[in-house]
């Protein structure tokens, strides 16, 4: 017998309805957040519902339209940026997506003082990146892989670099691997605080092997997309950092910043750049074997017009148990003396905490401590440090904002958010105005998200910026699933899980179970956030129990759990999902003949390996855009966790951890394999190899490809994908349509 959620026969329950797949695909229950676009200590910009750009002054309570929707509409602008002197606005249109962060666009400059567009010396199109200087209205932009500078929007441009070449030399923008795996930005140029200098990265991809795939389009012949993409063990981009004086750019030209000797001795990466003052800059470098990071503070030498990076200002961060940092090496937040800084790294107990570095890392003063982790430093002022952590009530999947008074001794700590809306809000981020005079809190859940404005001195709530009233009203007649976050203790490992239960869940009944997995290193799936998504629908309408489990390799619970997967991806992540499933079965309400697992990307890899684990636990499963062999994935990401695929390093585990090696084990499960043919990230090659191995092993399976779709499977493909996966699961669980 198939158990369905029972209907309660009182009048109120009768007006309630379950979620539908259509609700999810239409985004009916999506929420809004409000992030002020801060332009001073007490002013911010926001785009109104009717598309005017409005300037709000918190102190006077006044607001006025700085840019009319008529102007936005005249160029079909989808984004804008106000110059710091408030004289100009750039308007961005013709957005054309490239990779995860990168896109090209057409830019128009509107002169606010004259009330018209700037006409002389117009910008070329399409532009790869454009930004204002932090002071005044200088413009830096990247066009055809070269960097240009304008002293004023109407001035002729000054060309800074000349060697830019498509897929070969990238100036001021990252290549594919740096964008996706190191910088996580579309840009690789940084203005000094007052706009005197402009630092930029040059990436040389000349020797990088190219991934090529067909883009079918509508033409008679498909196009071939070529991307320099270093897979594990391949030749990497060569990076150089330059700084140019933007006041007299032609005087000495770009000056290269020296790489620390201990880094330059072998393959290395540049990981981030932080300006300290106009004449002091901090660069972070990383060895290709990513367990050694060097933070180098460099000073401008006026006499030589060069940048000097003394060894005494080199700070080394090394991991002996895994890789350096979490997902990325953390960046420093400098204090007002312009030499000391705050930084998050592992303490002696293996928890990531805030440290204050005044002279050497060895003499660092630990600012936070405990069996929890500091996650982000938002702002350091003269007397306060604002950060987020998961300390409160020992739930790793929460985020609260704390303030440490660094102006007083001993420093005192206050949780700003812990008791604000305790049931509704347990997962926060924040956005601070200049000098932290005011800040916005954005709460993501577990209740309906809410954004509020606060006084930076007293922490008093000033006003609600967005409370999602329409969403709250729309959900009043919806039977939402119940959610619970709990933990399992297994062999000295804590496995946090989130369980999504059907609305009329009854522990005495049996329910089909779907495991949703990601499981990648330094990820976290069990978070106290609000979501109405596909799995909400599966619980609400289809009566499934859905579980998410954070196993070994996941983040914010200490290095022991995080670094457990170091050099052996694909082992413990899978084991821990299986362990959790066994524990869920023991709870008594899971139909053990109807258990499925699904995941996307890294989750597709884990779900594939779990299905092929030979445990007999899973009846079926889905892998969307999975990695199938670490030899196929990007060097920067893969080698961070796996080392190199060489005989004298870790080739053996590269070979042992493939999905293809387990092809035989798929014989007794229903497997749905899905991939976009234009996936620039996890190449279609991964699924092609799984399919080949399954065919060679004469194992039946189901597959779906999405022509010309990338790793995100967006647009109409999304609807098709979730409809297809729903049919697959309902069939697997013998649920009627």
């Amino acid at each position: 017998i198939v158990l369905r959620p029972s209907r309660v026969h009182n009048s109120e329950e009768n007006t309630m309805r379950a979620l539908t797949l259509k609700d999810i695909l239409n985004g009916t229950f999506s929420y809004k957040t409000f992030f002020p676009n801060w332009i001073s200590g007490q002013e911010y910009l926001h785009q109104s519902a009717d598309n005017n750009i409005v300037l709000y002054n918190i102190e006077t309570g006044q607001s006025y339209t700085i840019l009319s929707n008529r102007t936005m509409k005249s160029v079909n602008a989808s984004n804008y940026g106000l110059s710091p002197d408030r004289q100009f606005v750039y308007l961005e249109s013709d957005y054309s997506k490239l990779w995860r962060y990168s896109y090209t666009a057409t830019y128009y400059i509107y002169d606010l003082s004259n009330g018209e567009f700037v006409r002389g010396n117009e910008l070329p199109r399409p532009i790869q990146y454009l930004c204002w200087s932090p002071v005044g209205s200088k413009l830096a932009y990247v066009y055809q892989n070269n960097i240009y500078l304008k002293q004023r929007p109407g001035d002729p441009p000054f060309q800074i670099t000349f060697n830019g070449r498509e897929n070969k030399i990238f100036n001021g923008i990252p290549d594919w691997v740096y964008e996706e795996e190191m910088l996580a930005t579309k840009y690789a140029l940084w203005w000094s605080p007052n706009g005197k200098f402009l630092a930029y990265a040059e990436f040389n991809d000349t020797d990088i092997p190219v991934i090529a795939y067909s883009y079918y389009g509508d033409e008679q012949y498909p196009r071939t997309i070529n991307i320099p993409y270093p897979k594990a063990g391949a030749k990497n981009p060569v990076v150089r950092i330059f700084i140019i004086d933007t006041t007299y750019p032609a005087y000495v030209g770009p000056q290269e910043v020296p790489v620390p000797a201990m880094i330059a001795s072998s393959d290395y990466y540049f990981s981030w750049l932080t300006w300290v003052t106009d004449e002091r800059v901090c660069l972070q470098w990383l060895k290709r074997v990513q367990n050694v990071s060097v933070l180098s503070i460099c000073d401008f030498r006026e006499d030589w017009q060069t940048w000097d990076c003394p060894k005494t200002q080199e700070h080394i961060e090394e991991s002996r148990t895994g890789w350096a940092g979490g997902f990325f090496v953390s960046t420093p937040v400098f204090s007002y003396d312009a030499i000391s800084y705050y930084k998050i790294f592992s303490d002696k107990d293996g928890y990531k905490h805030i440290h204050y570095i005044k002279d050497t890392v060895e003499n660092a003063i630990q600012i936070t401590s405990g069996k929890w982790e500091a996650i982000n430093i938002f702002r350091v002022t003269q007397d306060s440090l604002f950060y987020s952590s998961n300390e409160f009530e020992e739930y790793p999947g929460r985020r609260n904002i704390y303030r440490i008074s660094i102006g007083s001794y001993p420093p005192s700590k206050k949780c700003v958010t812990c008791h604000l809306r305790k049931e509704r809000c347990q997962y926060y981020t924040a956005s601070f105005s200049d000098y932290a005079k005011y800040y916005a809190l954005v709460c993501y859940g577990p209740g309906i998200p809410i954004s509020t404005l606060h006084d930076g001195r007293t922490d008093q709530e000033i006003k609600i910026l967005e409370e999602n009233k329409e969403l709250e009203n729309a959900l009043k007649n919806i039977q939402l699933p119940k959610e619970e976050i709990k933990k399992l203790e297994v062999d000295e490992i804590t496995l946090w899980y989130k369980m999504i239960l059907p609305p009329q869940f009854d522990r005495s009944k049996k329910y089909p179970l779907l495991i949703q997995v990601y499981g990648g290193p330094c990820s976290q799936s069990v978070r106290s956030v609000f979501a109405v998504n596909w799995i909400s629908y599966l619980a609400s309408k289809e009566g499934m129990v859905i579980a998410l489990v954070d196993g070994r390799g996941t983040a914010f619970q200490g290095d022991k759990l995080l670094y457990a997967v170091y050099r052996k991806l694909g082992v413990y992540e899978v084991e821990d999902q299986i362990t959790a499933v066994r524990k869920f079965i023991e709870m008594g309400f899971i139909d053990e003949k109807r258990i499925a697992i699904w995941g996307w990307s890294y989750g597709g890899y884990v779900s594939s390996l779990a299905l092929a684990s030979g445990t007999g636990l899973f009846k079926c499963g889905i892998a969307v855009a999975p990695v199938s062999s670490w030899e196929y994935y990007a060097s920067v990401y893969t080698e961070r966790f796996m080392g190199l695929p060489t005989k004298d390093d870790n080739l053996e585990h590269y070979k042992n951890s493939t999905v293809m090696a387990r092809a035989e084990y798929f014989r007794n499960v229903d497997y749905l394999l899905i991939h976009g043919t234009a996936d620039d990230n996890v190449h279609f090659q991964n699924s092609a190899q799984i399919a080949k191995a399954l065919v060679n092993a004469q194992v039946d399976f189901q597959a779906m490809w999405y022509s010309d779709q990338n790793h995100g499977l967006s647009g109409l493909s999304t609807n098709h994908l979730y409809t297809h996966m729903t049919h697959f699961l309902k069939q697997c669980f013998s649920l009627s349509d």
């Epitope: 006025y64 102007t71 005249s74 408030r86 004289q87 009330g115 018209e116 006409r119 109407g154």
Partner: antibody, heavy 124, light 113 residues
């Protein structure tokens, strides 16, 4: 009929400052920017700067930057131009003029109405 | 800055005759997006403020007699008074509003011969 009415003539000593007002009427003040143009005896017209009444943001000719301040009082539909550190070469007739705000990127407007002018004489 | 140069500096024309004033800009005043020339012509009579006659190089301001016409493209422009009247005695200025700073020609004085 649109009107831009300027304050009266001024005589100033070198080094002093002068502030000229321009009161507008019979049109929507915020639909136009206000510009200041001067004309020294026997010289061509010279643009000093302008201001957008919607946001109070001025734009100055580099030649006058640091010496000129243009402001608006939207409640009074009035614009002001203050010129400091006056020298004899600043002796001129100072005009205010309006110019329609261009919302579209292919727009652009000339100065269609002018004030009657204010004679500023700088003499020791 | 865009430099505007007018010729001649002065012009004496008989009543009812054609008067032609030229204006040259140091760079093009054509906006590529709309192919319009951002050039205006003003008339200034003694003791009066300038009065707008022509904008976009050839569009007459409302109320301006049709004997006034403007032409030209790019860097070379002309103001023509097809049949000079006594009330047309004035100084005429061209002005570019393509980019800032806004700049004017030195002026052309039109008199009756």
């Amino acid at each position: 009929q649109v009107q831009l009415v300027q304050s009266g003539a001024e005589v100033k000593k070198p080094g002093a400052s002068v502030k000229v007002s321009c009161k507008t009427s019979r049109y929507t003040f915020t639909e136009y920017t206000i510009h200041w143009v001067r004309q020294a005896p026997g010289q061509r017209l010279e643009w000093i700067g302008g201001i957008n009444p919607n946001n109070g943001i001025p734009n100055y000719n580099q030649k006058f930057k640091g010496r000129v301040t243009i402001t608006v009082d939207t409640s009074a539909s009035t614009a002001y131009m203050e010129l400091s550190s006056l020298r004899s070469e600043d002796t001129a007739v100072y005009y205010c003029a309006r110019r329609r705000i261009a919302y579209g990127y292919d727009e652009g407007h000339a100065m269609d109405y002018w004030g009657q002018g204010t004679l500023v004489t700088v003499s020791s | 800055d865009i430099v505007m140069t007018q010729s001649p500096d002065s012009l004496a024309v008989s009543l009812g005759e054609r008067a032609t004033i030229n204006c040259k800009s140091s760079q093009s005043l054509v906006y590529s997006r709309n192919q319009k020339n951002y050039l205006a012509w003003y008339q200034q009579k003694p003791g009066q403020p300038p009065k707008l006659l022509i904008f976009w190089a050839s569009t007459r301001e409302s109320g301006v007699p049709d004997r006034f016409s403007g032409s030209g493209f790019g860097t070379d422009f002309t103001l023509t008074i097809s049949s000079l009247q006594a009330e047309d005695v004035a100084v005429y200025y061209c002005q570019q509003y393509f980019s800032y700073p806004l700049t004017f020609g030195q002026g052309t004085k039109v008199e009756i011969k």
